[in-house]
């Protein structure tokens, strides 16, 4: 017996589509070998119609696809717009030739079934409304009108003009006439359910002079649209249920045995498994809406349904739309940390991957908010102003071509805890979700700036120092000036770099920045940070205020003041280093775009591809060291 398996018999009707699943043994060779679908000819030859190598025959052009699911050891052949000519014997198989492993499938495509000559066929989806048209002659204008449903030989009355309504059609069926029409009546049946399907007879009058019309009602289950998405990518369910449910609550649910569990609805219900990674967005006033889910997981695969009902829950007889979501584990989207931890007063550097082919796309970072349907207001972007409340503490560093950008948030508070999304205006699959957890700090921060009350005087020299611990000894230290479009790195001077790492003195590891002479435009936020290549680490921020020199105040160079506070030998060394390093700009993040790991403040190692915003220091006044 063949190790390939599938449906032996597939039957359908003209114009419809089929999805044929073929199972194969789970081996590495089978997962990667060619899959095919061919038609068996009378001569024994099996002519390929479609294969996983990309071949598509002329007769299948624009109406067929073959998709391999290696994780399920299956492949699916989808064929649309069937005609009776598609009836025949086929094989689904594996191998470089059509003589390899295969399974025989018989496909039968019939004509739409024939009914009595005057039968009108109505095809409607579940939950919709059908209007059955019933014609009669003038002689029956004042006679009783009715609609009955055929059950075997009997015909059971659904509704009639004496106001009788079958209990199973209560509140769903109405019989009416339009305007002054004297030869036609109508029956509306709303909230259609599968058992409503069948042959109906409408009648005006009684006995031999009665006028009768046949109506065949077909109630269709929604054919699920197949969605194929990569692990960690995102999916959007576009739901268009029609105007008649525009004012009802909307929902997206996931089928689970005989129920459909609501994931999100417009009444505020949300499944905790989707917390932080789901948004429901109304599209227009006609009831259209979309649901976006990011950070797809293997367990997200399954059958989904959107619908509308005042309860926000699935109800039989209300319109639905269906999808089957497949999540491909062989993803192009790199694995990045889903949880980032920080402490109050500290900082986090979050690496956001994006499609490397779209390096020029605009990058954004938004904060997911749980209210109602979920929303994600942008906090920072490559061409977006930093949101109010984040000035001086949030920046996006982009290194085009590296496949990632870094978002740094400092001066953390517990209110910063929550979910954040990385997104671009390019490939929408590359949306990643990060949960930020901010705990109360239990120790002093790793980076400390002195003086802490930083006020610089116009025209004078102002130096600010950043103290760092020995664990950052080998990392690159930098100062940058924060602005609405990023944090532009400045030339700076590392005091600790002259010592050997063996004799690292915790108290003397300093990177300083000098403004000389101070100008009014130097006022603002400055960051001191550490990084390794393009991997950003800890940062701290300080606001430098700039004021006019007050008359009569003695002119003291802050550098000298800082120097006097230290012991003399250190002062000598520092002075010489100032002269030696003067006007050297020795930080250029543009030179690096490598992939490394960094271990930060006890945090777990994080695989990052990060980048630096190579903003020039040209806007700064004087030379800074």
């Amino acid at each position: 017996q063949s190790p390939i398996f599938g449906p032996q018999d597939v039957s359908s009707i003209e114009g419809n589509s089929v999805s044929i699943t073929c199972y194969y043994p789970d081996t590495s060779v089978n997962r990667h070998t060619r899959k095919y679908w061919c038609r068996q000819g009378a001569n024994g030859y099996c002519a390929t119609l479609i294969s996983s190598n990309g071949y598509l025959s002329k007769e299948y052009s624009g109406r067929a696809s073959l998709i391999n699911f290696p994780e399920n050891s299956t492949f699916v052949i989808n064929i649309a717009h069937l005609t009776q000519e598609d009836t025949g014997s086929y094989k689904c198989g594996l191998g470089t030739t059509n003589r390899g492993l295969f399974f025989d499938v018989s496909l039968e495509v019939s004509q739409v079934p024939e009914f009595p000559n005057d039968t009108h066929v109505y095809t409607k989806d579940i939950g919709r409304t059908v209007t059955i048209e019933c014609r009669f002659k003038e002689g029956n204008a004042h006679s009783k009108k009715s609609l009955c449903k055929k059950r075997g030989e009997a015909c059971e009355v659904v509704i009639d003009s004496t106001e009788y309504v079958d209990p199973s059609y209560k509140d769903r069926a109405i019989l009416f006439m339009k305007g002054t029409s004297r030869d036609i009546f109508y029956v509306n049946i709303s909230h259609l359910i599968p058992s409503d399907a069948g042959l109906y007879v409408c009648q005006a009058g009684e006995g031999p002079s009665a006028d009768k019309n046949n109506a065949d009602l077909q109630v269709l289950e929604p054919e699920p649209e197949l969605l194929y998405k990569d692990l960690r990518s995102s999916v959007t369910f576009e739901c268009d249920l029609g105007r008649e449910v525009a004012n009802d609550a909307k929902y997206l649910c996931r089928k689970n045995k005989e129920t459909c569990d609501v994931i999100i609805n417009t009444l505020g219900k949300r499944d905790p498994a989707f917390e932080g990674r789901i948004l429901l967005t109304p599209r227009d006033d006609n009831g259209r809406f979309s649901v976006l889910i990011t950070g797809l997981r293997k367990e997200d695969a399954g059958h989904y349904q959107c619908g509308a009902h005042s309860s926000g829950l699935p109800q039989e007889g209300w319109p639905v739309q269906a999808w089957q979501l497949f999540v491909n584990e062989e993803s192009t989207i790199p694995n990045s940390r889903s949880v980032v931890k920080g402490v109050t007063g500290g900082s986090v550097a979050i690496v956001c991957p994006y499609n490397p082919k779209e390096s020029s796309s605009l990058k954004y970072w938004c904060h997911w908010e749980a209210d109602e349907n979920g929303r994600c207001p942008v906090l920072v972007g490559t061409q977006a102003l930093v949101q109010e409340g984040y000035e001086g503490r949030l920046a996006l560093f982009d290194q085009p071509g590296s496949g990632a950008y870094t978002v740094i948030l400092n001066q953390l508070t517990t209110q910063d805890s929550g979910f954040y999304w990385c997104l671009t205006d390019g490939d929408s699959r590359w949306r990643t979700t990060i949960e930020l957890q901010v705990a109360e700090a239990t120790k002093k921060p790793d980076l400390e700036v002195t003086p802490q009350n930083a006020t610089a005087v116009i025209g004078e020299t102002f130096t600010i120092s950043c103290h760092y611990p020995c664990k950052f000894y080998s990392q690159e230290k930098y100062w940058c000036k924060w602005s609405n479009d990023g944090c532009h790195i400045l030339p700076s001077h590392d005091e600790g770099a002259r010592q050997s790492s063996v004799s690292c003195d915790q108290s003397s590891q300093i990177v300083s920045m000098t403004l000389n002479p101070v100008k009014k435009e130097d006022e603002g936020w400055y960051w001191c940070g550490v990084k390794e290549g393009q991997v950003y680490g800890e940062t701290t921020a300080i606001y430098v205020a700039v004021e006019e020199r007050t008359r009569g105040s003695p002119h003291i160079n802050p550098t000298d003041a800082n120097a006097r506070a230290k012991d003399a030998p250190e002062e000598e060394a520092m002075e010489s280093s100032v002269r030696e390093d003067e006007n050297k700009a020795n930080l250029d993040p543009r030179l690096f775009a490598d992939e490394r790991e960094i271990q930060n403040a006890g945090d777990q190692a994080q695989e990052n591809r990060a980048s630096g915003n190579a903003g020039s220091a040209g806007g700064q006044s004087g030379s800074s060291k």
Epitope: F5, V10, N16, V18, S19, Y23, E221, E223, E258, H303
Partner: nanobody, 127 residues
């Protein structure tokens, strides 16, 4: 509550025919995949046949041992599943179970794919 009730089992002679039925309630029949399995004492349940619907297409699956002899069908209006068995052999003797998979997950031949099961009906084929 989901219920599957099999009927139609009995004792027949080899080469005779038999029709098994399964009445389903409490589940979306037309959007479920329905299967027949059988089990002989001391052995695992084995796949016999299955049927699934999508839109207006029907998919029928058979084990090689019954192909050409058994026909699976379903009536969506009555929520019933049938198994027409012709040319019965003594080795077809077993308890036959009806099963339902509303989610269309997994391999149609694997019993673990199906969430709901009937109590079974005994079919005995004497030679």
């Amino acid at each position: 509550e989901v219920q599957l009730v099999e009927s139609g089992g009995g004792v027949v002679q080899a080469e005779d025919s038999l029709r098994l039925s399964c009445a389903a309630s409490g589940l979306p029949f037309s959007s479920s995949r329905m299967g027949w399995f059988r089990q002989v004492p001391g052995k695992e349940r084995e796949f016999v046949a299955a049927i699934g619907w999508s839109g207006r297409s029907t998919y029928r699956y058979y084990d090689d041992s019954v192909k050409g002899r058994f026909t699976v069908s379903g009536d969506n209006a009555k929520n019933t599943l049938d198994l027409q068995m012709k040319g019965l052999k003594p080795e077809d003797t077993a308890v036959y179970y009806c099963a339902a998979d509303p989610n269309y997950y997994g391999d149609v031949r694997t019993s673990g794919t199906y969430q709901y099961w009937g109590q079974g009906t005994q079919v005995t084929v004497s030679s």
